[in-house]
């Protein structure tokens, strides 16, 4: 198959890091500086990404792979392949159009990015609040009030052992 393809398209012989030059009878030429081809058989090389401004270079461009960027300190990546950099906030804050703002009461953010999320509602699971929430931390739910009645055990009994040769139903 590979042989047939080569007869049809001479460009299929050009490896990654080169391009198939239409202007020179489809010879394989090395990618020029600041460009790359990550697959074989390409008729041109793609221009290397440049990590400028708030972006910084995580991996240099080579003739066979594009540069990779990340963000300068105080910023974090957003989007596929770190297409954008967004400002960090402190834990307990979220980024708004007007900058970093503290989480409203009843919400928290335990990261330097993302939005403030509501505290867990323990009562929805029939549990009680063991540790109160803060701007930086979610509440910790404890056992339900019923579980705390005298004589109640919080230890779960072990699962019955399976007999050898039996598969679960």
């Amino acid at each position: 198959f590979e042989r047939t393809r080569s007869l049809q398209d001479p460009c299929s012989n050009c490896p990654a890091g080169t391009f198939c030059d239409n202007n020179r009878n489809q010879i394989c030429s090395p990618c020029p500086p600041n460009s790359f081809s990550s697959a074989g058989g390409q008729r041109t090389c793609d221009i290397c990404r440049q990590c400028k401004g708030v972006f910084r270079t995580r991996k240099e461009c080579s003739s066979t792979s594009n540069a990779e960027c990340d963000c300068t300190p105080g910023f974090h990546c957003l989007g596929a392949g770190c297409s954008m950099c967004e400002q960090d906030c402190k834990q307990g804050q979220e980024l708004t159009k007007k900058g970093c703002k503290d989480c409203c009461f009843g919400t928290f953010n335990d990261q330097k990015r993302g939005i403030c999320r509501p505290w867990t509602n323990c009562s929805l699971d029939g549990k009680s609040v063991l540790v109160n929430g803060t701007k930086e931390r979610d509440v910790v739910c404890g056992p339900s009030p019923a579980d705390l009645s005298p004589g109640a055990s919080s230890v779960t009994p072990p699962a019955p052992a399976r007999e050898p040769g039996h598969s679960p139903q």
Partner: antibody, heavy 123, light 107 residues
Framework: QVQLQQPGAELVRPGASVKLSCKAS????????INWVKQRPGQGLEWIGN????????NYDQKFKDKATLTVDKSSSTAYMQLSSPTSEDSAVYYC????????????????WGQGTSVTVSS | DIQMTQTTSSLSASLGDRVTISCRAS??????LNWYQQKPDGTVKLLIY???RLHSGVPSRFSGSGSGTDYSLTISNLEQEDIATYFC?????????FGGGTKLEIK
């Protein structure tokens, strides 16, 4: 800025060859292909051929192989196209164009165009 | 040779309209499709190369799309200065070939 300067018009006698010029400025002349394109009155565009000034490597559309000869003068950054034995069929506007950056994604596009030379073949 | 076909030879539109011009290749051209604008005075400019990449200085109201054999140029908000003839050109294989052009006029 990139400029490709062409004379506005040429009047040619039938059978007497004509050499059209295209003076390039604003970029490294030897590093980019120069193309020539023909446009008959009220018609579309036809690619004639191209030349790489650094080593004078040329390509031609088969249709123009015996009609056009492409050359360059590196010292003056000028490309030339000679039309042999002109007839009324050769009356047209001829554009020289610069190709995109060598090997990169715009390589097979013509990113800058001259104003064109209007060639009239008439006795 | 690869044939390039622009089925619409002329197109009439109003200022502010969204206009789409199409171009078809006789075989797959792997996105090596360029669009040019020719003004009534004969001046030619590259608008879009490699299907969708905007040439420097070209207004963002111009955009390109397509793949394989079918490609299109869109002008999102037609302005008076866009009145011109538009040509597609394939750069996939020598000889490079152009479509017949689409002349854009104002209603």
């Amino acid at each position: 800025q990139v400029q490709l300067q062409q004379p506005g018009a040429e009047l040619v006698r039938p059978g007497a060859s004509v050499k059209l010029s295209c003076k390039a400025s604003g970029y490294t002349f030897t590093s980019y292909w120069i193309n020539w394109v023909k446009q008959r009155p009220g018609q579309g565009l036809e690619w004639i051929g191209n030349i790489y000034p650094s080593d004078s490597y040329t390509n031609y559309d088969q249709k123009f192989k015996d009609k056009a000869t492409l050359t360059v003068d590196k010292s003056s950054s000028t490309a030339y196209m000679q039309l042999s034995s002109p007839t009324s069929e050769d009356s047209a506007v001829y554009y020289c164009t610069k190709s995109g950056e060598y090997g990169k994604i715009g390589y097979y596009a013509m990113d800058y165009w001259g104003q064109g030379t209007s060639v009239t073949v008439s006795s | 040779d690869i044939q390039m076909t622009q089925t619409t030879s002329s197109l009439s539109a109003s200022l502010g309209d969204r206009v789409t011009i199409s171009c078809r290749a006789s075989q797959d051209i792997s996105n090596y499709l360029n669009w040019y604008q020719q003004k009534p005075d004969g001046t030619v400019k590259l608008l879009i190369y490699y299907t969708s990449r905007l040439h420097s200085g070209v207004p963002s109201r111009f955009s390109g799309s397509g793949s394989g054999t079918d490609y299109s140029l869109t002008i999102s908000n037609l302005e008076q200065e866009d009145i011109a003839t538009y040509f597609c050109q394939q750069g996939n294989t020598l000889p490079y070939t152009f479509g017949g052009g689409t002349k854009l006029e104002i209603k």
